[in-house]
């Protein structure tokens, strides 16, 4: 077990700030819930602090809690390849490019790391080259997320690792936009961190509203699993 | 307990400027977005600007864009605001408060800024 | 926009009533706070009808339509102070203030 690991054996509670900033729309989020890396679940709840959001909160999933993929589940037989708690409690800085298909791309740089006993999220996203009614600021997504496999390869030369993913967000009409995503992730800390072979996680989101919140806001609910490497020959004969 | 201090108010003539500082105690700063509210002599209260927790995002009234610029040191706990080209129409008592997501949740005491000559 | 009426007054012991009326308002939370001569402002209702710790359970708050209400239940003399209510705006005027309402107790 790393010494990041031991953080997560109960519920941690977790703290998303994000400031936005898509085609000069100027937005911020805060978020609040918890997670349970035992299960490799998430239970968030983000608030636009500005009024409304200006983009659809769909497209902001994997900027907030696939940012905080140390609450992943990973088999014991892949514990080895753990980067995201191993990191912890210094935390590790994760930027990404998130390519819309045929629309505009996000910018994202964020700061994961433990205050206190509080793994906090602090997010700087910048979006550029959007079409007013495209998909994402015309607002044509549907409120629903779907499953996604998301892969991870070591980055030697930085300490760190590389992932990447594509998610696909249905739109009202019946199709899918697109979205490329390429994620960096390296240490803040001077300490050691696992790097891992390569493989994936595996993710469940499902979006929510509470009926009793009148400012624009988003429940998530998630399931992270890591999974993609199987078990060595001295696993299969003990 | 949750504490601001207000500071940096004082006499200014017209097209002066003034930075105000606020310090903040009792809680993690960092984690709160802030602003600033104004009340001019027997008047009511008026929403001056605002930052986010992060500080990259600021946000401003429509009577001060431009002329006011709010920023933060997360390091010093301290929250500022520089004024500049004051009109008489800004003198006021300034209030620095903590924003709990949409609304104001603690305020200082205030310091009162007065732009004549 | 948010209006205020200027003035309202009320004998001791009786029930206080302040409105504050804008646009489809009951859409969004509405947030009262207190200010007596020469101090800041304190809230005393957030999120339409929630009281923070600390605040007399005599202060309550509604909202629906386009009016919400203060309702101060058997009002002290201590109770007379302005009140503002307050709300957020999409418009990235992020608060917006009633005018005020003094509060005087006969």
């Known amino acids: 077990m790393s010494k990041g690991e031991e953080l997560f054996t109960g519920v941690v509670p977790i703290l998303v700030e994000l400031d936005g900033d898509v085609n000069g729309h100027k937005f911020s989020v805060s978020g609040e819930g918890e997670g349970d890396a035992t299960y490799g679940k998430l239970t968030l709840k983000f608030i636009c602090t500005t009024g409304k959001l200006p983009v659809p909160w769909p497209t902001l999933v994997t900027t907030f809690s696939y940012g905080v993929q140390c609450f992943s589940r990973y088999p014991d037989h892949m514990k080895q390849h753990d980067f995201f708690k191993s990191a912890m409690p210094e935390g590790y800085v994760q930027e990404r490019t998130i390519f819309f298909k045929d629309d505009g791309n996000y910018k994202t740089r964020a700061e994961v790391k433990f205050e206190g006993d509080t793994l906090v999220n602090r997010i700087e996203l910048k979006g550029i080259d959007f079409k007013e009614d495209g998909n994402i600021l015309g607002h044509k997504l549907e409120y629903n997320y779907n499953s996604h496999n998301v892969y991870i390869m070591a980055d030697k030369q930085k300490n760190g690792i590389k992932v990447n993913f594509k998610i696909r967000h249905n739109i009202e009409d019946g199709s899918v936009q697109l979205a490329d995503h390429y994620q960096q992730n390296t240490p803040i800390g001077d300490g050691p961190v696992l790097l891992p072979d390569n493989h994936y996680l595996s993710t469940q989101s499902a979006l929510s509203k509470d009926p009793n919140e009148k400012r624009d806001h988003m429940v998530l609910l998630e399931f992270v699993t890591a999974a993609g490497i199987t078990h060595g020959m001295d696993e299969l004969y003990k | 307990q949750v504490q601001l201090v207000e500071s940096g108010g004082g006499l200014v003539q017209p097209g002066g400027s003034l930075r105000l500082s606020c310090a903040a105690s009792g809680f993690t700063f960092s984690r709160y977005g802030m602003h600033w509210v104004r009340q001019a002599p027997g008047k009511g209260l008026e929403w001056v600007s605002g930052i986010s927790s992060i500080g990259s995002n600021t946000y401003y009234a429509d009577s001060v864009k431009g002329r006011f610029t709010i920023s933060r040191d997360n390091s010093k706990n301290t929250l500022y605001l520089q004024m500049n080209s004051l009109r008489a129409e800004d003198t006021a008592v300034y209030y620095c408060a903590r924003w709990y997501k949409t609304y104001i949740d603690v305020w200082g005491q205030g310091t009162l800024v007065t732009v004549s000559s | 926009e948010l209006t205020q009426p200027p003035s309202v007054s009320v004998a001791p012991g009786q029930t206080a009533r302040i409105s504050c009326s804008g646009d489809n308002l009951g859409k969004k939370y509405v947030y009262w706070y207190q200010q007596k001569p020469g101090q800041a402002p304190v809230l005393v209702i957030y999120?339409?009808?929630e009281r923070p710790s600390g605040i007399p359970e005599r202060f309550s708050g509604s909202n629906s339509g386009n009016t919400a209400t203060l309702t101060i239940s058997g009002t002290q003399a201590e109770d007379e102070a302005d009140y503002y209510c307050a709300s957020y705006d999409s418009s990235h005027i992020l608060i917006v203030f009633g005018g005020g309402t003094k509060l005087t107790v006969l």
């Open positions: 999120g339409d009808d």
